[in-house]
Interface confidence: low
């Protein structure tokens, strides 16, 4: 028998330095956690220990922070580089620069090979990105060799930025004549490597023949065996055991996310590849394991060139800002309400006295905030800060919608509701009631807008046939988070301002904030 | 098996509105995009636009807009095409195409309806 | 629009004989490129998708080759069964647009 141990992270999200436990900036350094010098520390520990070790990372590390904020991802380069990662998997958020974004500061940059066998490059791009990324990698480990084969959600041309000339195949037709390949190169023993969710995941594990684990990404999964050490629930034990359709039981894991749990997985394969057991659990990155030295001292001499960002007060919080994923992607959250608040703020326009304003409503994708504020940090908000909460670098843009398409959207908003998905909508100016115990697209039982051809501003249904302007991100303008309709029915869309000036705007012009959750959502009785 | 059944035969009169429909079975409906293909009598086929059965989005040829409108109903798993102000020029076999892929984004339109006539007459 | 040159418009051969017919678009497609089959009354039948790429259950005398602008069809041994209208489409851009046809008889 032969023993691999396998290390992953998975959707770190820009997090180079420490953070607090729910992945927003560190306040009290005792308590942080996570950070790639943290990382590099369990890591080298891991990897004097045991003979045959595999660093792997399986996407998203781009986005996040104000790291890639200014660096633009040559960050992900040198620190990857630094931690000497064995592959990585291309996540949809390294798309989120362009090809070009991927291109300089990553794929050129990189010592590790860096995977996707889903993705398909055409036209002239084809020759330009050839050989920076690979459908699979064999890695010798030891005396043996181990194949790598990568996979990116198909869903990428939908969430980020890839342009026209990358086709994004089904992942699992897309990987079943690469595994083949490894077979018939007598490598034996093979990874898939991957970021389209923990439900991809499980099919790749039942459907690719060949395939031996399963390391993924993209849903932020948690799974842990045992008493979790952290606020994190478990979505099943670590690893997940899928049963192939051709009988094999295959190991499935995914690390939570931001750099907080280093995956830990140890896989005894015979010698024939077959793995004979499998076991392991994500580890908490505490502060009980130390930062590394050299790393962290590097990690500050980098940090230097993010301090103009970082350290002017825009205003004060006296309330936290709950942008959390378990709060926005599944109810009102006051980050939500802030966010839109300074959208319209920002569009304030009195040009006709027929209006109080040209525009009074707002939708924002809840998948868009990224992260909470914590008040506690003597309420200071800082641009750094709101990097982490929208750190797209999209803009917030003005278009004209029917009635009927807004209705499409908020139908759409809730057409999965309870999967944790982004396109759940935050609102301003909106006032919506969802019954959850309707089949999907008929869940609006209301949907009332603030007038804004009146002296006073009220609510008033929602009418079909009128057009509206609406407030949005240009993300949602642009079809993201399946919001097709309206990218398809837009009757006009300007492009507006930077996202993170409007709330850094609003938020020093008002000095000090206190948004508060305020029945903007709701939902009807015996749904919720 | 894989099955897109169309509806009858249309005879109607200029100026008047007409909607067909393309009943899929076989497949999740949701999951392919459903484009719509006209012919007319002895010439060759032209494109009118889609519809994705999973959101609702459509797309048009610029030559068919405002006279295609593409809606879909999940329930029945029934894509249609109702198409306004006919006049002769409309007289054609109207054919419903799934956008069917092999590796994801491989594309083709590999089943079709077997086609609705409809003829505008006074 | 991209526009689709279809050649020849129509043309006899005998059974046995190898056919090609092509196909030029006025820009380059990137061999996003479908050809169809059609009989007198019937609905479109799809043989080849992505320029090369047989659909399954369509006989292998069937082929397509071609990248760029130009495109072909090949009949490696023609059949009775082969007799009808082919189609070219293009889907690399917006609007989709087909070939006027091609109507193959029998010599």
């Known amino acids: 028998a032969w023993e691999l141990t396998i290390l992953h992270t998975n959707d770190v999200h820009s997090r180079l330095e420490q953070t607090s436990e729910d992945s927003s900036k560190c306040v009290n350094a005792s308590r942080c956690m996570g950070g790639v010098a943290r990382l590099f520390t369990k890591v080298q520990q891991i990897r004097r220990a045991e003979p045959n070790v595999l660093l792997l990372d399986a996407g998203d590390q781009y986005q996040g922070t104000i790291w890639f904020t200014v660096y633009k991802g040559a960050e992900v380069a040198h620190f990857m580089n630094a931690l000497r990662y064995d592959a990585m998997a291309l996540g949809n958020h390294e798309f989120d620069n362009g090809v070009e974004g991927l291109i300089e500061p990553l794929l050129k940059e990189a010592k590790f090979p860096i995977l996707s066998a889903n993705i398909k490059a055409k036209g002239p791009l084809a020759s330009q990105i050839s050989g920076l990324y690979l459908p699979y990698k064999v890695l010798p480990v030891g005396d043996e060799v181990v194949g790598i084969v990568g996979y990116t959600s198909k869903e990428t041309p939908f969430l980020s930025n890839p342009g026209t000339n990358l086709v994004f195949e089904d992942e699992i037709t897309a990987l079943q004549p690469e595994v083949d390949k490894l077979k018939t190169l007598n490598v034996n023993k093979i990874i898939a490597l991957g970021h389209s969710g923990f439900e991809m995941d499980k099919l790749i594990a039942q459907k690719v023949r060949g395939v031996d684990v399963v390391v993924g990404g993209h849903s932020n999964t948690f799974l842990y065996t045992g008493n979790p050490p952290s606020k994190e629930v478990p979505a099943g034990k670590y690893p997940f055991i899928v049963t192939s359709d051709d009988g094999r039981k295959v190991p499935v894991v995914q690390a939570y996310a931001f750099g907080k749990y280093l995956g830990y997985l140890k896989i005894e394969f015979d010698e024939r590849g077959n793995v004979i057991s499998s076991h392991g659990n994500p580890i908490l990155l505490n502060s009980s394991i130390p930062e590394d030295p050299s790393i962290k001292a590097d990690i500050n001499k980098w940090r230097i060139k993010l301090d103009n960002y970082s350290t002017q007060e825009l205003g004060k919080t006296i309330v936290y800002l709950d942008g959390s994923s378990q709060s926005c992607r599944f109810r009102e959250c006051n980050m939500g309400n802030l966010i839109c608040d300074a959208m319209i703020n920002n569009n304030l326009r009195h040009t006709d006295e027929m209006f109080w304003n040209h525009v009074s409503m707002c939708i924002l994708n809840g998948g868009g905030i990224r992260s909470p504020i914590d008040e506690r940090n003597n309420g200071t908000i800082t641009w750094e800060n709101l990097a982490a909460v929208l750190p797209f670098g999209g803009t917030f843009d003005l278009v004209q919608l029917k009635g009927s398409t807004l209705k499409k959207a908020f139908e759409h908003s809730v057409h999965r509701y309870g999967q944790s998905t982004g396109e759940f909508l935050q609102v301003g100016g909106i006032h919506v009631v969802y019954d959850l115990s309707r089949k999907p697209g008929d869940r609006v039982v209301k949907l009332d807008v603030l007038c804004t051809k009146c002296r006073v501003p009220s609510y008033d249904p929602l009418k079909m046939d009128e057009v509206y302007k609406v407030i949005l991100p240009n993300f949602l303008a642009n079809g993201g988070d399946g919001f097709q309709m309206i990218k398809d029915e837009l009757l006009r869309h300007d492009s507006g301002d930077q996202d993170i000036n409007v709330v850094s705007t609003y938020i020093s012009k008002m000095k000090v904030i206190y948004p508060a959750v305020e029945g903007r959502i709701k939902f009807s009785t015996g749904s919720h | 098996e894989v099955q897109l059944q169309q509806s009858g035969p249309e005879l109607v009169k200029p100026g008047a509105s007409v909607k067909m429909s393309c009943k899929a079975s076989?497949?999740?409906?949701?999951?392919?995009?459903m484009h719509w293909v006209k012919q007319k009598p002895g010439q060759g086929l032209e494109w009118i636009g889609y519809i994705n059965p999973y959101n609702d989005g459509t797309k048009y040829n610029e030559k068919f807009k405002g006279k295609a409108t593409l809606t879909s109903d999940k329930s029945s798993s029934t894509a249609y095409m109702e198409l306004s102000s006919l006049t002769s020029e409309d007289s054609a076999v109207y054919y419903c195409?799934?956008?069917?892929?092999?590796?994801?984004?491989?594309?083709?339109?590999?089943?079709w309806g077997q086609g609705t006539s409809v003829t505008v007459s006074s | 629009d991209i526009v689709m040159t279809q050649s020849p418009s129509s043309m006899y051969a005998s059974l046995g004989e190898r056919v090609t017919i092509t196909c030029k678009a006025s820009q380059d497609i990137n061999s996003y490129l479908s050809w169809f089959q059609q009989k007198p009354g019937k609905s479109p039948k799809t043989l080849i998708y992505?320029?090369?790429r047989l659909v399954d259950g369509v006989p292998s005398r069937f082929s397509g080759s071609g990248s760029g602008q130009d495109y072909s069809l090949t009949i490696s041994s023609l059949e009775y069964e082969d007799m009808g209208i082919y189609y070219c489409l293009q889907y690399d851009e917006f609007p989709l647009t087909f070939g006027a046809g091609t109507k193959l008889e029998l010599k």
């Open positions: 195409a799934r956008w069917g892929y092999d590796e994801g984004y491989y594309y083709a339109m590999d089943y």
């Open positions: 076989g497949y999740t409906f949701t999951s392919y995009v």
């Open positions: 992505r320029a090369n």
